[in-house]
């Protein structure tokens, strides 16, 4: 059985403009640290999609270290008590409350770098992360709604006469499946307990001059295209798996 062919120009494309994939850090350059910071910095929240199994670095507001009293990271993950990592500059002391995930750590010593790192991002790291910089002039916050992205496994096969099935298995968020040319399609979604979604699109082409069909899977982690030849052989089951 022949494998479905990838369209290389589309397969796993990543664009530098794609906020989700451009970088695993949203940190500012040290030169941008504000010495006369303004209340504009007081509360910033960012939605940040991050690919699973990558490393992520989350940053505090750009406040000069000499103005700091305390740095705190509050981490709220689904189904877990709020974890707090705090550093008190005066005593060079760190404290942790309810923090059990050893992959979530300070990047280095907090007195040198207030950033937080997640090593090998997992689905369980989905949640809200907030840095609180306590200064004499008030508290300055930067929050991240971290959305962990899981690349779906894509398969394409023909299961009946002039009917093809394209599946994007266990993606996060759900992938979007489209076909060229368009056919008579039905799409179903299956939700898994770990937050991933399997999308299955079944299409039938009545028109006999359609011999090759392409399944295009769009996802935040990148796009994939596969094509398959429709063989009108009764009982034939042509199968292919993405490589």
């Amino acid at each position: 059985e022949g494998a479905a062919q990838p369209n290389n120009s589309l397969m796993l494309q990543t664009s530098k403009e794609n906020h989700a994939l451009a970088s695993s850090s949203l940190c500012m350059d040290e030169k941008q640290i504000t010495q006369n910071y303004s209340k504009v910095l007081a509360e910033v929240n960012t939605s940040w999609p991050v690919k699973m199994a990558t490393n992520a670095v989350l940053c505090c507001p750009p406040i000069a270290l000499r103005n700091l009293i305390i740095i705190t990271w509050e981490i709220i993950l689904r189904g877990q008590p709020s974890c707090t990592k705090a550093y008190k500059k005066e005593t060079n002391e760190t404290k942790e409350t309810n923090c059990t995930d050893e992959r979530i750590t300070w990047v280095s010593r907090p007195d040198q770098n207030s950033d937080l790192q997640i090593r090998t991002v997992a689905i369980t790291h989905d949640g809200y992360y907030r840095c609180i910089m306590v200064t004499p002039d008030g508290n300055f916050h930067r929050g991240y709604h971290l959305q962990v992205l899981v690349t779906p496994e894509v398969t394409l096969f023909q299961n009946r006469n002039r009917t093809a099935v394209c599946k994007a298995v266990a993606g996060k968020p759900a992938a979007h499946i489209s076909w060229i040319p368009e056919g008579d399609c039905a799409t179903k979604q299956e939700y898994w307990s770990n937050g991933t979604v399997t999308v299955k699109s079944t299409c039938h082409w009545e028109v006999h001059n359609v011999s090759t069909v392409t399944c295009h899977v769009s996802h935040l982690t990148g796009n994939k295209s596969l094509y398959i030849e429709l063989l009108p052989v009764p009982g034939a089951k042509k199968s292919a798996k993405l490589y």
Epitope: I69, I70, T72, T84, A86, K88, K89, E90, T91, E93, K95, T97, I132, V134, T135, P136, D137, G138, N139
Partner: antibody, heavy 124, light 107 residues
Framework: EIQLQESGPGLVKPSQSLSLTCSVT?????????WSWIRKFPGNKMEWMGY???????VYNPSLNSRISITRDTAKNQFFLQLNSVTTEDTATYHC?????????????????WGPGTMVTVSS | DVRMTQSPSNLAASPGESVSINCKAS??????LAWYQQKPGKANRLLIC???TLQSGTPSRFSGSGFGTDFTLTIRNLEPEDFGLYYC?????????FGSGTKLEIK
Amino acid sequence: EIQLQESGPGLVKPSQSLSLTCSVTGFTITSGYDWSWIRKFPGNKMEWMGYIGFSGSTVYNPSLNSRISITRDTAKNQFFLQLNSVTTEDTATYHCAKSFVQNTFIYDWFFDFWGPGTMVTVSS
Amino acid sequence: DVRMTQSPSNLAASPGESVSINCKASKNISKYLAWYQQKPGKANRLLICSGSTLQSGTPSRFSGSGFGTDFTLTIRNLEPEDFGLYYCQQHNEFPLTFGSGTKLEIK
């Protein structure tokens, strides 16, 4: 039991400096906690002025930043307030106080021990 | 700065009654509010911290509630020694700020 007691002149002339002492007994100020000055104006309004930490670092209310200095004498277990260029608006009862410490140190800036306060009038 | 608005300024009640004092913050201070009692010639007394945590030695007739911007101190079954001046204080951020005070008097 920790006790705090304020002392200093009850009358200060405008444009001069106000200097107060807080004497602490029952605890060594270099062993822990933050040690604050708080004042209560006529009419009952309260203002936190600043603190000196047990390591000697200071944090001041930005509204007083240019005029305030909090220092200490570890040998005498005392800490001090100096407020420069006073005006009649600085007339108040001045309290020293000790911060509380919980299991986490980010939100523990409230006060479980206070001095009774010393009244300071600024007048010519 | 976080402005703390306390109400009422004055309150008169009789022993055995219940009273409530309110404190409103100009911005979200989460749960980080303390309540104090002041009496003439005595050191200020910390009653409650973190919105609802009773300080050791605070009688159980005192209770604190609220979150974000709106907080309440409730005293049930007033005792004669409960009369005095009450203050709220936010301990969420610097500069630390206080309410304007509530004078609780015997009716």
